[in-house]
């Protein structure tokens, strides 16, 4: 089938990095500057992606492959092929349309991206709070209160000033 196709369509012989030039008797011509063809038999070359402004070049365009972009530091990629750049926030914050905002009490975010999530509710697993949660860190659940009867454990949990096990409603 490939041989038959080659006989019928001279363009099928044009390799990646070239295009089948109808203006020149279907001769295989190299892709012009700032364009590429990633497969053989192409009748046109695609324009290279330009990484500018908030985007920076991760991989230069070549005659056979498109440029690849990532985001300038302070922002991170979103979408297939880094189609968008989104602002980083600090740990303990989440991104809103108003910019980076601190996590509400009872929630945390330990990354520079993503949303604030509720602290673990230790009591749902029958456990107690060993370490209080913060905006940047989840609570640490310890043994269940029953396990902490005298002599059962050498761990003495601090008495928290507040019970941070759930997000405020």
């Amino acid at each position: 089938f490939e041989r038959t196709r080659s006989l019928q369509d001279p363009c099928s012989n044009c390799p990646a990095g070239t295009f089948c030039d109808n203006n020149r008797n279907q001769i295989c011509s190299p892709c012009p500057p700032n364009s590429f063809s990633s497969a053989g038999g192409q009748r046109t070359c695609d324009i290279c992606r330009q990484c500018k402004g908030v985007f920076r070049t991760r991989k230069e365009c070549s005659s056979t492959s498109n440029a690849e972009c990532d985001c300038t530091p302070g922002f991170h990629c979103l979408g297939a092929g880094c189609s968008m750049c989104e602002q980083d926030c600090k740990q303990g914050q989440e991104l809103t349309k108003k910019g980076c905002k601190d996590c509400c009490f009872g929630t945390f975010n330990d990354q520079k991206r993503g949303i604030c999530r509720p602290w673990t509710n230790c009591s749902l697993d029958g456990k107690s709070v060993l370490v209080n949660g913060t905006k940047e860190r989840d609570v640490v659940c310890g043994p269940s209160p029953a396990d902490l009867s005298p002599g059962a454990s050498s761990v003495t949990p601090p008495a928290p000033a507040r019970e941070p096990g759930h997000s405020p409603q």
């Epitope: 402004g53 908030v54 979408g79 968008m84 750049c85 989104e86």
Partner: nanobody, 123 residues
Framework: EVQLVESGGGLVQPGGSLRLSCAAS?????NYWMIWVRQAPGKELEW???????????YYVDSVQGRFTISRDNAKNSLYLQMNSLRAEDTAVYYC????????????????SGQGTTVTVSS
């Protein structure tokens, strides 16, 4: 082709003012949130302000709140940043960028930006 072209940068003394413009083409400007960001020498890119499609919502980073004003003219496909009471720390390359057609809780990214215009604040 979607294009954003910034202009209006230059050298200004501390306390002075500048108005940056961003000319948009190749897309329906009025359908998108628009954003200003900047990059100071040796610093990370910083989000400054954004504005919704009709200009009724505007938000600013704390460091420019009360000094900078973002605005848009959809009839002219243009975005603006009025910068007053400029300080040395405002020295940076300023970029305008296109945000989403609709902001959601899942992302507040930008998919296109210009080449930038340089603002230098110095006496």
């Amino acid at each position: 082709e979607v294009q954003l072209v910034e202009s209006g940068g230059g050298l200004v003394q501390p306390g002075g003012s500048l108005r940056l413009s961003c000319a948009a083409s190749g897309f329906t400007f009025g359908n998108y949130w628009m954003i200003w960001v900047r990059q100071a020498p040796g610093k990370e890119l910083e989000w400054l302000a954004n504005i919704n499609q009709n200009g009724s919502e505007r938000y600013y980073v704390d460091s420019v709140q009360g000094r900078f004003t973002i605005s848009r003219d959809n009839a002219k496909n243009s975005l603006y940043l009025q910068m007053n009471s400029l300080r040395a720390e405002d020295t940076a390359v300023y970029y305008c960028a296109r945000g989403g057609a609709d902001y959601s809780n899942s992302h507040y990214g930008m998919d296109v930006s210009g080449q930038g215009t340089t603002v230098t604040v110095s006496s």
